[in-house]
């Protein structure tokens, strides 16, 4: 997990006090137990959330360098429609498996200038990034 | 949704460049069509993610100023098991409804305290916070 | 009227692979659940597995290291392998046709009349 | 795995008689369970479905009831056709199951 440079250093002033990290070290933000493998249109009776679920999910790592948080990871649905809470293996077609998005905030890393415009180090810009978050299984909308 | 004081202001350098908010107004990050009526343990046939699911949720808001974000939305069950697909109203207890947490990244505003100790603004301390984003609706887990 | 009819080898050395074919007459093979149940000599009834649409298949998780059911719907036939048998598996095969409730496999009609696999050296 | 226990294993009867089977689960399968009646040398024979049902061309005098854990298979008037045994098998969840049978002899 890199750490990026100094944010907007000026004259007397520490530079790594601006933007004070964790005292406690970051992992990536990794699902809990992120399994990429063995992964189908199935839920199992064990393993995480997403493979357990009726509406299972694969994760796919979205990683910039330039922005708060570096990695981000975005849900993709692995069937259709929901499985069979009676045998975890086949599709029931009354229910479909729908992605949850979120507006989540996320910090870029952006030049700063100063008020001749020279550049001064680097500023946050605060912005709202679209993630799915899982995927779910849902009653399908009936058109009014 | 309030600003911040400036972030660690430093003589010489504009202090609402430290923090560059984005230029377009941000609205408070409240999860899309939230509705916190007539929820219950139900699969509606219309409406938002959380009240069409199997596995319905509403929202708990949870502010604090001193956190960016300063809202944060809890997702919280509305069932202990899995709403029939077919029926849209009884539960199922072959399946669970579980709540899907995630350590987002998160910045709280901190005094920032100069080389000699005084007060010098406010810095941002980066910290996990867990949150729940929504319910799944999973197989139970089979003990081996 | 479907009608299910079992044929392959009554004999089958251990270690080796068990080979079954069921072949459907009078009726579709699609949106069922096509299985197969066995039965040792002057013993009860045990699910194997399924195999529907042919694509998701089931199986019981205590023969599932060994088990492959397929699906050849041009010839209306599926099919059971069963690997590395051992005299336990000697029985009375049945293929059935697990009946389409609310997209749950529910009960076994009809079935075929059986056929008996010895495992023996 | 959900087990299925039948009492008796056996019964002895006589024509005319009234015959219960019960069939009871390791844990609730809501009204997810099938009868079977099989007869030496034969295949298994669907008579009840969903707990209750009667499957067509079965005889009226056969009636299934029950949900959750218990069940009952009851011949209101035992035939000299129905002498078999006779199995139940649940739907509720996978691996499908039956019970070990109960084989009903002529007295």
């Known amino acids: 997990y890199s750490h990026w440079p100094s944010c907007c250093p000026s004259k007397g002033y520490p530079s790594e006090e601006l933007l004070r990290w964790s005292t406690v070290p970051v992992p990536p933000l990794k699902p809990a137990s992120l399994d990429f493998h063995s992964v189908s249109c199935r839920a199992s009776e064990d393993g995480p959330l997403n493979s357990r679920a009726i509406s299972p999910w694969r994760y796919e790592l979205d990683r910039d360098l330039n922005r708060l948080p570096q990695d981000l990871y975005h849900a993709r649905c692995l069937c259709p429609h929901c499985v069979s809470l009676q045998t975890g293996s086949h599709m029931d077609p009354r229910g479909n498996s729908e992605l949850l998005y979120h507006n989540q905030t996320v910090f870029y890393r952006r030049p700063c200038h100063g008020k001749k415009g020279n550049h001064k180090g680097y500023c946050l810009e605060r912005r709202l990034y679209r993630v799915s978050l899982a995927c779910v299984c849902v009653r399908p909308r009936v058109m009014g | 949704y309030s600003h911040w004081p400036s972030c660690c202001p430093s003589k010489g350098y504009p202090s609402e460049e430290l923090l560059r908010w984005s230029t377009v107004p941000v609205p408070p990050l409240k999860p899309a069509s939230l509705d916190f009526h007539s929820v219950s343990c139900r699969a509606s046939e219309d409406g938002p993610l959380n009240s069409r699911a199997i596995s319905p949720w509403r929202y708990e808001l949870d502010r604090d100023l001193n956190r960016l974000p300063q809202d944060l939305y809890h997702a919280r069950c509305l069932c202990p098991h899995c709403v029939s697909l077919q029926t849209g109203s009884h539960m199922d207890p072959r399946g669970n409804s579980e709540l899907l947490y995630h350590n987002q990244t998160v910045f709280y505003r901190r005094p920032c305290h100069g080389k000699k100790g005084n007060h010098k603004g406010y810095c941002l301390e980066r910290r996990l916070y867990r949150v729940s984003l929504a319910c799944v609706c999973v197989r139970p887990r089979v003990m081996g | 009227q479907v009608q299910l009819q079992e044929s392959g080898p009554g004999l089958v050395k251990p270690s080796e692979t068990l080979s079954l074919t069921c072949t459907v007459s009078?009726?579709?093979?699609?949106?069922?659940?096509w299985s197969w149940i066995r039965q040792p000599p002057g013993k009860g009834l045990e699910w194997i597995g399924f195999?529907?649409?042919?694509?998701?298949?089931n199986y019981n998780p205590s023969l599932k290291s060994r088990v492959t059911i397929s699906v050849d719907t041009s010839k209306n036939q599926f099919s059971l392998k069963l690997s590395s048998v051992t005299a336990a598996d000697t029985a009375v095969y049945y293929c059935?046709?697990?009946?389409?409730?609310?997209?749950?496999?529910?009960?076994?009609?009809?079935w075929g009349q059986g056929t008996l696999v010895t495992v023996s050296s | 795995d959900i087990q299925m226990t039948q009492s008796p294993s056996s019964l002895s009867a006589s024509v005319g008689d009234r015959v219960t089977i019960t069939c009871r689960a390791s844990?609730?399968?809501?009204?997810?369970l099938n009868w079977y009646q099989q007869k030496p040398g034969k295949a298994p024979k669907l008579l009840i479905y969903?707990?209750?049902s009667l499957q067509s061309g079965v005889p009226s005098r056969f009636s299934g009831s029950g949900s959750g854990t218990d069940f009952t298979l009851t011949i209101s008037s035992l035939q000299p056709e129905d002498f078999a045994t006779y199995y139940c098998?649940?739907?509720?969840?996978?691996?499908?199951?039956f019970g070990g049978g109960t084989k009903v002899e002529i007295k």
């Open positions: 059935a046709r697990g009946y389409n409730w609310n997209y749950e496999i529910a009960w076994f009609d009809p």
């Open positions: 009078g009726g579709s093979i699609s949106n069922y659940f």
């Open positions: 195999n529907y649409n042919s694509g998701s298949t």
């Open positions: 844990q609730s399968i809501s009204s997810y």
């Open positions: 969903a707990a209750s």
């Open positions: 098998q649940q739907s509720y969840l996978t691996p499908l199951t």
